[in-house]
Structure formats: C-alpha cells, structure tokens
Amino acid sequence: ASGSASGSASTLVHNGTSARATTTPASKSTPFSIPSHHSDTPTTLASHSTKTDASSTHHSSVPPLTSSNHSTSPQLSTGVSFFFLSFHISNLQFNSSLEDPSTDYYQELQRDISEMFLQIYKQGGFLGLSNIKFRPG
Amino acid sequence: SVVVQLTLAFREGTINVHDVETQFNQYKTEAASRYNLTISDVSVSDVPFPFSAQSHHHHHH
C-alpha cells in the first residue's frame, strides 16, 4: 500500500525553496511545476515558520518559492530529465503516521529527506524532487 | 523498515541514472550520521517522458 495520503499536496523542492502544486488522485499530470527559466525565477522573501521536532518554531526569511509568472497548475518544459528513486530506511519502522502528511513524524522525515537530496545533488543541473511517498518495507 | 519513493528532476543531459545512483550511494554514510537514516536497497530508474503522476508504480525495482 502506498504510504501517501490521497489528494495531498506535493512539493517540488529545489535550491532551498519549494513550489507547491496540488493534485488529486485522478490527476494524470505532473504534480509539480518547473519554471522554464529556473535560475531566473523570482522569489518572494516573506517570512515563514517551520515546526521543528522539539515543538519550537523557527522564523527565518527562507521562503517557499513563489513564481510570479507561473500558475500553480502543473507545467513542464522540455529539457528536463526525471528519475524515479527508491530506497529503504532500515532503522525506522513504518507506522500510520507516515500515511498522514499532517503528522510531525511524516513532516520531519520528509524535511530530512528533501534537505538531504538538495545537498547531495546541489552541484549542477538539479532542479528538485517531488512525490515523496512512504510505504512499509 | 520504511520504503521511500520519490522523483528527482534534472536539467536534461546533466546526469544519467548511473550517476544519480552513484552520488546517492556516496552519501549514505553521511545521511546515517546527519539525519539518523540508515539507507539501503537503493534503486534508480529513468522516468519516460511524458511523465504521469502514476509512473512511479511502473518503475520500482
């Protein structure tokens, strides 16, 4: 069974920012938006809060990406390669929290994985990651 | 254990499947240390274009 809740918002995370695009289970389109000129995408430097795993709140000016010239409906430009990646995390146990994107456990794991990939592939060509799903091993 | 599935996007021509997997495997140890995630059974595959939201399920090894 898939570990992601149906109809949840998925995020393309890239370069420390994120662009949101909501999909429904029936959607056949790409569940994220990639601006055609990624490096030139304008950002809105609005403060946001991130819940941490100590139940504190972090305030910074590292914002979600806002594309002023693009709608939130999924878009694709040519010149993009996609790779599907899967792996096991052997020191974690799957539980129902990983089926619910609103839980702290889900959000913490998603945050860690997103940050890890942003760092591993930050040099050259990486546009982002999307559709993180969790399921039992 | 937990299986994680996701999609990575790159500018076309900048990386191939082998390099995606190699780079990820290179940092598995650091991931264990930094994020407390012990990673194994890494699998990477191309997602054919046009991409669909369901294409995950056809490419899991």
Epitope: T50, T52, S60, V62, D112, Q119, I120 | T29, S33
Partner: antibody, heavy 122, light 106 residues
C-alpha cells in the same frame, strides 16, 4: 574571520530553563550547520544536536529530545539552544560549533564558540 | 550509540618524544576527527577525516586508521602540544566522542 561568540555564564535553579546564544560572523550563516555540544566538569564532550539555518531543520540526540530546543534567527546570524527542566547533571560548558552540508560534511566541526558555563544549583 | 575508547587516558612525555594515541570504536566507522583542547578553552578541530590536518596544525601531527582502530601520532612533541585530545565519530547518529587523552609534561 569566522567567529562564533556565545552568551555569558548562567546560574540556574533545578527545574528552570536556560537559553544560550551563539552569534556567527565571517561567513554566510545559512550555508553551514550549527551544532551544540556540552562538556560537564572532567567529562567527555557530549553531542546535543544540530540546526541548519538555511531551513530551520534540526535534529537532537535522543538523550535530550523533549528538553532541548534549537532555533535560529537568520536576520541576526544567531543560533539558540534552550534546555529545560534543568538538573544538577546539566552543569556543564555548552559549545556551539559550525560544520558543513554534503558534500563537505567530512570536514568536521571547524569553528567553535568560546563556551558558555551553565551552573545548576539550588 | 557507537562508543569510542581512547588509550591511554593520560600520558606523560618529554619535549621531542614521539607520542601515539589510539581511538577504538565499538563498531566500524568511516572516519574519525580529532580535537585538541586546552584547559578553559574550546576544542579545536585538529585532524579531520582520519588523516587530514586542520588549518594551522603542524606537520608533526598525523592521523591514520580504518574500521574500528585509529591513531593520532606526534612525531616530536613540542611544548604547545601538551593538551587533551579527543576523537569523534560521525558515521552513526548521534555523533560521539572518546573520553580524551591528556598529554602531560614529564
């Protein structure tokens, strides 16, 4: 020149909380992790946790989870570590130290604050 | 958690002596870091990734090892080298430190 400057010594009663600050300068604050490490008198160094100022993401040693809060104020290039429900065993020098994201993680914690002495006593 | 055991816990040596400190891990690690600490001061990164000298560290210091056994060696001890040395692993979370080796003047 890279510098991490910590707040001054604190004396606290058991059950209280303490908040230690660590102001960074000489580099781009959001590019590096900040770690917190403590050292009780005559004891080995003990790792507490980290925060990534670029995202606010953090992680804690299970020993301290639930009692420690690590935050940053990016506009002030300052990290904070708050430890609650203090007990006498928390008497220690608390250090902040910066390190690197991938792929430079293996460089280690290369700059440290001068340390903040926290004394817990009734 | 991975335990790091340093030996000896302390040693007395003279200027010019060759000194070796060992760090043994309870399970295999990819690499270790070494820190130098003097009384009342913060630790300083001394050797990173097992064998790389940190900035400003004299070439008389060297590090080696793999798996579970690592060493820090000073080829010819100098007065400024008297301090406590700690090893650290970061192959497993949480990072852990050895108990330290205090190098004293004989």
């Amino acid at each position: 020149e890279v510098q991490l400057v910590q707040s001054g010594a604190e004396v606290k009663k058991p059950g209280a909380s303490v908040k230690v600050s660590c102001k960074a300068s000489g580099y781009t604050f959001t590019d590096n992790y900040i770690n917190w490490v403590r050292q009780a008198p005559g004891q080995r160094l003990e790792y507490m946790g980290w925060i990534y100022p670029g995202s606010g993401n953090n992680k804690f040693n299970e020993k301290f989870k639930g009692r420690v809060t690590i935050t940053v104020d990016t506009s002030a290039s300052t990290a904070y570590m708050e430890l609650s429900s203090l007990r006498s065993e928390d008497t220690a020098v608390y250090y902040c130290a910066r390190d690197y994201p991938f792929p430079s993680y293996h460089y280690g914690m290369d700059y440290w604050g001068q340390g903040t002495t926290v004394t817990v006593s009734s | 958690d991975i335990q790091l055991t340093q030996s000896p816990s302390s040693l007395s040596a003279s200027v010019g002596d060759r000194v070796t400190i060992t760090c043994s891990a309870s399970s295999s690690v990819s690499y270790i870091h070494w820190f130098q600490q003097k009384p009342g001061k913060a630790p300083k990164l001394w050797i990173y990734s097992t064998s790389n000298l940190a900035s400003g560290v004299p070439s008389r210091f060297s590090g080696s090892g793999s798996g579970t056994d690592f060493t820090l060696t000073v080829s010819s001890l100098q007065p400024e080298d008297f301090a406590t040395y700690y090893c650290q692993q970061r192959s497993s979370y949480p990072p852990t430190f050895g108990g330290g080796t205090k190098v004293e003047i004989k």
